[in-house]
């Protein structure tokens, strides 16, 4: 006899029992319930959702599903082999004895197996779709990463190129700095040498000045004595004349009772009979204030009041407004007489201005202006010049019309810069103009291409710094 029974075991798995005579066959089928239910975030029989799966999680799940599929396949193969090998005889008997019942059982088993196989195939198809979807996503991400990587690589290359450029520029600048340091050290050494030379020169000059000052004191004393003697002699002569003249005579001889002892300029001194070049004391017009000046009694008939002189660079001409107003330096050497005195003097009578120049090649030239005067301090000692003649250029190197005077602390020029600071010294700067006789003194062989030297453009051109200069004035009617 045979019968067929379907039941559920204690674990909840379905089992099929076939009773055939003394033999009983129990089939335990794998359940689909062991897979995740459709309520899971990953639906077993649905299309992959948009939310990306974690890559590791996908791989793990795929491995699990592959294992299940392999188990099922092995189980089916075992079952098939078992049926083929061990049930041939029984099946013959079953077919003979209970064809109808067994057919039904086998159909149900077959159907169940087919259903399960179909279910597994569907699951596998789903998994394949998920894997394909995930692979596509990963490929897309990989492509994006590749693009990003390319961009980053390009940026890195650009930055590397920029760094190289900067390094090159840095190297160039470093080299430039090194070159400059070398030049500066050379210049510093040269300046030190010049300083030493100048110190020797200064010490020599100091001793010469001391001797000259002693001589000057002696000369002044002698001069005072001479003036006193002259005064006494004049009084004696006057007394004698008075005694000799008739008391009834109406035409008495007119002789100055007192010799002039104050002079406003060197022309007056020359006319008084003192015709030796040297230092004399001048008196401000309408004042008792005195000033020492050098009188040139030799050049062009004499009587010249020297208002500026440069010869060796021993005096610094980069001075303040006050210093240029009052004067500075030594009348025996380099000096500036003073703007205030010259302004007052030239404001009362008509004066001529003579400028004498010497270059480093032994040449001399001069410019003569037939009318010269300085305006007052309220007009910044503006210079007025007319009637140029001479050998130091047909065009005036002092800008026309006249400019205001400027110093390092009083900028009155017509330049966007400060000429006195740029060119050194106080002068009637324009913007800045073709001349500056109060510029920086440069020795021979260092006197060309200078931006701040002693300049008289219309004689020696630009950048040539002169060896010596003298500015002198004299009344036009001398």
């Amino acid at each position: 006899y045979s019968n067929f029974r379907k039941s559920v075991d204690s674990t909840g798995r379905r089992q099929y029992q076939v009773q055939n005579g003394p033999c009983s066959y129990t089939f335990l089928l794998p359940e689909t319930d062991s897979c995740r239910s459709s309520s899971s975030p990953y639906m077993s029989n649905a299309v992959q959702r948009d939310a990306p799966l974690d890559y590791d999680d996908s791989v793990q799940r795929l491995q699990v599903l592959e294992n299940i599929l392999e188990n099922n396949t092995q189980w089916l193969m075992k079952l098939e082999n078992y049926i083929q090998d061990n049930m041939k005889k029984e099946m013959v008997e079953i077919q003979q004895n209970v064809v109808q019942n067994q057919t039904a059982v086998m159909i149900e088993i077959g159907t169940s197996l087919l259903n399960q196989t179909a279910a597994q195939t569907r699951k596998l198809t789903d998994v394949e779709a998920q894997v394909l979807n995930q692979t596509t996503r990963l490929e897309l991400q990989l492509l994006q990463h590749s693009i990003s990587t390319n961009k980053l690589e390009k940026q890195i290359l650009d930055q590397t190129s920029e760094i190289n450029k900067l390094q090159n520029k840095n190297s160039f600048l470093e080299q430039k700095v090194l070159d400059m340091e070398g030049k500066h050290s050379e210049q510093l050494q040269s300046m030190k040498e010049q300083k030493d030379e100048l110190q020797v020169l200064v010490s020599k000059q100091s001793s010469v000045i001391d001797e000259l000052e002693k001589k000057l004191v002696t000369a002044t004393v002698n001069n005072s004595l001479l003036q006193k003697q002259q005064h006494d002699l004049m009084e004696t002569v006057n007394s004698l004349l008075t005694m000799m003249s008739s008391p009834n005579s109406k035409s008495s001889v007119a002789i100055r009772k007192e010799e002039q002892t104050t002079f406003r300029d060197c022309a007056e001194i020359f006319k008084s009979g003192l015709t030796t070049s040297g230092i004399y004391t001048l008196t401000f017009p309408n004042s008792t204030e005195e000033i020492k000046a050098y009188c040139d009694m030799d050049v062009g008939g004499g009587g010249w009041t020297v208002i500026q002189h440069r010869e060796d660079g021993s005096v610094d001409f980069q001075r303040t407004w006050k210093e240029y107003k009052e004067g500075f330096g030594s009348p025996l050497g380099e000096y500036w007489l003073g703007n205030e005195f010259v302004s007052q003097l030239t404001g009362q009578h008509r004066y001529v201005l003579k400028i004498q120049l010497k270059d480093w090649e032994g040449n001399e030239a001069h410019s003569l202006y037939d009318h010269f005067y300085l305006a007052g301090e309220e007009s910044n000692y503006r210079i007025h010049l007319t009637g140029l003649t001479g050998t130091a250029g047909k065009i005036s190197s002092i800008s026309q019309p006249g400019s205001d005077f400027s110093t390092k602390d009083s900028d009155n020029d017509k330049c966007i810069c400060k000429c006195s600071q740029m060119l050194s010294g106080g002068w009637w700067f324009d913007a800045c103009g073709p001349s500056n006789l109060n510029g920086q003194y440069y020795p021979q062989k260092q006197n060309t291409n200078k931006f701040n030297g002693i300049k008289w453009y219309y004689w020696k051109g630009s950048g040539y710094s002169l060896k010596a200069t003298t500015m002198m004035i004299r009344p036009a009617d001398f």
Epitope: I416, C417, G433, S462
Partner: nanobody, 129 residues
């Protein structure tokens, strides 16, 4: 010490081109204007072209406008004068000269010749067929 050295002069046919260079040392082109001047035999020295502010401002004499171009390379401390369509009347000794850029009269754009205190030795340009 300031030094300016011109180069690039020579003999060229009418309509030809030359490029003059002025290499400066002892100054930086950022702080100075550089001018090109020329002097033909028996004539006064005249301004041709000038440059300042590293090329920000340029000047040309009417006689060379459209034919000459001035430029500078601050890294080389050099100023160039590109001369095209040269004529026989361009024959002269060409000089470059320097002036502190700030030495400029209020309201003016360029500098009188006497403001240029540093000069080169010159380079001869001869335009002849």
């Amino acid at each position: 010490e300031v030094q300016l050295v011109e180069s690039g002069g020579g003999l060229v046919q009418p309509g030809g081109s030359l490029r003059l260079s002025c290499a400066a040392s002892g100054i930086t082109l950022d702080d100075y204007a550089i001018g090109w001047f020329r002097q033909a035999p028996g004539k006064e020295r005249e301004g041709v072209s000038a440059i300042r502010e590293s090329g920000g401002s340029t000047y040309y004499a009417d006689s060379v406008k459209g034919r000459f171009t001035i430029s500078s390379d601050n890294s080389k401390n050099t100023v160039y004068l590109q001369m095209n369509s040269l004529r026989p009347e361009d024959t002269a000794v060409y000089y470059c000269a320097a002036v502190p850029a700030g030495r400029l009269r209020y309201g003016e754009q360029w500098y009188p010749i006497y403001e240029y205190d540093a000069w080169g030795q010159g380079t001869l340009v001869t335009v002849s067929s």
